[in-house]
């Protein structure tokens, strides 16, 4: 039994880091493998992660952490019984994938303005809370070409757009994702999408 693709890990910079790897053949990850991880910190103890299958030869493990600070570094040991298959380390602050925003809501009752709001996925005491920026994706269910991205580079989790920038009388969907420039993170997953019917009063044309 050998590791074909070494574990790569990403952290949500809060409480979970996810590690993925591939074996050289079909593997029952949960019965055959264990991933031991330990914070490089005086008196800390090792923890064991039981991996799950992620495709035939793929494995994934969700490492639970108390919290994360930038200096944290973990040792990782991948075991198959008594055999050490791989040894490595992981610094969560250097491999951050933020949590996805939640509670995306479209408020359509503001005169001809669409107000999209969502929740910051981090508590106020987490470093990323004040460092997230967002991308909002809006698309038409009727017209695949009607697809747009709005970059929200301010901290407030909201976006205002004129309803007239979208077509009237048809349904739209929106979703939002986050990233943090300070840690050069990857983008989060998209939030669940929300749907609304876009309608607004056409301006009266004078001839």
């Amino acid at each position: 039994m050998k590791v074909l693709q070494e574990p790569t890990c990403v952290s949500d910079y809060m409480s979970i880091s996810t590690c993925e790897w591939k074996m050289n053949g079909p593997t029952n990850c949960s019965t055959e493998l264990r991933l031991l991880y330990q914070l490089v910190f005086l008196l800390s103890e090792a923890h064991t992660c039981i991996p799950e299958n992620n495709g035939g030869a793929g494995c994934v493990c969700h490492l639970l952490m108390d919290d994360v600070v930038s200096a944290d570094n973990y040792t990782l040991d991948l075991w198959a019984g008594q055999q050490l298959l791989w040894k490595g380390s992981f610094k969560p602050s250097e491999h951050v994938k933020p949590r996805a925003p939640g509670n995306l809501t479209v408020h359509t009752n503001v005169s001809d303005t669409l107000l999209l709001t969502w929740s910051n996925p981090y508590p106020p005491d987490n470093y990323l809370y004040n460092h997230l920026t967002y991308a909002v994706n809006i698309w038409s269910e009727n017209d695949p070409a009607d697809f747009r991205i709005y970059n929200v580079t301010y901290l407030e989790p909201s976006l205002r757009i004129a309803a007239s920038t979208l077509k009237s009388g048809i349904s739209y969907r929106a979703r939002v994702r986050a990233w943090a420039q300070c840690y050069n993170t990857t983008w989060s997953e998209w939030s669940p999408s929300t749907k609304w019917h876009n309608s607004y009063r056409e301006p009266f044309e004078q001839h």
Epitope: L39, V40, F41, L42, S44, D67, V69, A71, N73
Partner: nanobody
């Protein structure tokens, strides 16, 4: 220059309690309490990470000692309950920029547990 000033040591009866304090000039990733008993090597007793959420203990003090830090005052504490004669030692505060926790040391404070 980093300064660590411990206080709170003294003589206490078995089963008693003491609270040690350590004033630090600066904020550090790792803050720790070590102790050295007569004729023995210095050993780590308890450690705490920046932010103060994660704490770690030597098996010999688990359930009896509590480490904490007040980040606003840059002060480290060690609450010692149910003290035993074998807890008698000089207690040292130490801080570090990494998880080894041994970059800077205090001068030590003596704790004597005796009836």
């Amino acid at each position: 220059q980093v300064q660590l000033v411990e206080s709170g040591g003294g003589l206490v009866q078995p089963g008693g309690s003491l609270r040690l304090s350590c004033a630090a000039s600066g904020d550090f990733y790792c803050m720790a309490w070590f102790r050295q008993a007569p004729g023995k090597e210095r050993e780590a007793v308890a450690t705490i990470r920046s932010g103060g959420r994660s704490t770690y203990y030597a098996d010999s003090v688990k359930g009896r000692f509590t480490i904490s830090r007040d980040n606003s005052k840059n002060t480290l504490y060690l609450q010692m309950n149910s003290l035993k004669a074998e807890d008698t030692a000089v207690y040292y505060c130490a801080v570090g920029v990494d998880g080894n926790c041994r970059n800077y040391w205090g001068q030590g404070t003596l704790v004597t547990v005796s009836s």
